[in-house]
């Protein structure tokens, strides 16, 4: 049995860095409107980005089923190529990890092959982020 | 196994109002777009309404718009058809409808009748 | 508002290939879906996504989708096969169904 005393007690690091958000519509050749379920994420939702306060790698998961065929990228930074790029889709079920720093924002981009569809319906959709790196570089 | 169980049918007088209730289980409800679908007697299927997972946005359809009001409380699994002013061409059998993807209707309740008469 | 054109009756032969149409402007730009409905029952979906046949459906039944036409085929029409057909797709914000094909297996 372990005792601590008030001189004693380790180091407290921040909570881990993590967020799941739902999403049920995005909008053709825009992106998709995300929202967070519970408001004790330690990471947050601004402008339909996720924004990313620690450097690291995450952990990303991301699912879906769409109510018209599409092509979905994931992004990160303005310039850099996407997270995730999957093409001509009605589905998503993809996990990855990558790495991530302060000041980058998470965010959609939808297009489908159709002109008469501004509007994408979506079942079970969900965007995860982790963090792996706990005790990295943060700025808030 | 997915069920959708209607209820709240009945007989009701041009102008009068009714709420239809669908209760859902085996899947997870507050993911899903719901829609209500009807079928008049002898005639086809025609598409009512739909409500996002999360209750958020709703569609109606034209002769619907202003009198059917599309509901959902997650914490209940069930969803709702608010019917005000009916008319007669608003008798018809309401199913509740979902599926795995928004809009491909995999899975129907059994419906519920609505009558509209004086 | 968008109109879907359906046949409103058709006549098979038994094994015999059966093709149901759904006409709209430009469909074959939208995802169309097919539902099976016998008397007395609620509608089953045997197509999705022009194509696509979800478990349980039996292979006999197809679907293609291009131009101005969807077309619903069975390959070998069975006796248990004789029901209304109906077509739908999504055009702005609005589900739409077509008026159905009461298919007779002969």
């Known amino acids: 049995c372990l005792h601590f005393y008030a001189s004693q007690v380790p180091p407290q690091y921040p909570p881990i860095q993590s967020i799941r958000v739902q999403f049920t519509r995005c909008e053709n050749e825009k992106g998709c409107i995300i929202t967070s379920p519970s408001k004790d994420e330690t990471m947050k939702v601004q402008d339909n980005s996720i924004i990313i306060n620690c450097d690291g790698f995450y952990l990303i998961s991301l699912k879906g089923y769409f109510s018209e065929e599409l092509s979905l990228s994931l992004y990160y930074r303005k310039g850099r190529g996407p997270l995730f790029s999957l093409s001509k889709v009605t589905s998503v079920d993809s996990i990855g990890v990558a790495y991530l720093a302060f000041k980058d924002k998470v965010y959609f981009n939808v297009t489908t092959h159709s002109t008469s569809y501004k509007d994408i319906q979506v079942n079970g959709g969900e965007l995860i982020l982790i963090h792996q790196n706990p005790g990295g570089f943060c700025a808030y | 196994e997915v069920q959708l169980v209607e209820s709240g049918g009945d007989l009701v007088k041009p102008g009068g109002s009714l709420r239809l209730s669908c209760v859902a289980s085996g899947f997870t409800f507050s993911s899903n777009y719901m829609s209500w679908i009807r079928q008049a007697p002898g005639k086809g299927l025609q598409w009512v309404s739909q409500i996002s997972g999360d209750g958020i946005y709703t569609n109606y359809a034209d002769a619907m718009k202003g009198r059917f009001t599309i509901s959902r409380d997650n914490a209940k699994n069930t969803l709702y058809l608010q019917m005000n002013s009916l008319r007669d061409e608003d008798t018809a059998l309401y199913y509740c409808?979902?599926?795995?993807?928004?809009?491909?209707?995999?899975?129907w309740g059994q419906g519920t009748l609505v009558t509209v008469s004086s | 508002s968008y109109v879907l054109t359906q046949l409103s009756s058709k006549n098979v032969t038994l094994k015999q290939p059966a093709h149901i149409t759904c006409g709209g402007d430009n469909i074959g730009s939208k995802s169309v879906h097919w539902y099976q409905q016998k008397l007395g029952q609620a509608p089953v979906l045997i197509i999705y996504?022009?194509?696509s046949r979800p478990t349980g459906i039996p292979e006999r039944f197809s679907g293609a989708n291009s131009g101005n036409t969807a077309t619903l085929t069975i390959s070998g029409a069975l006796a248990e096969d004789e029901a209304d057909y109906y077509c739908q797709v999504w055009d702005s914000s609005a589900n739409v169904f077509g008026g159905g094909t009461h298919l007779t297996v002969l």
């Open positions: 409808a979902t599926g795995i993807y928004p809009n491909a209707f995999g899975y």
């Open positions: 996504y022009d194509s």
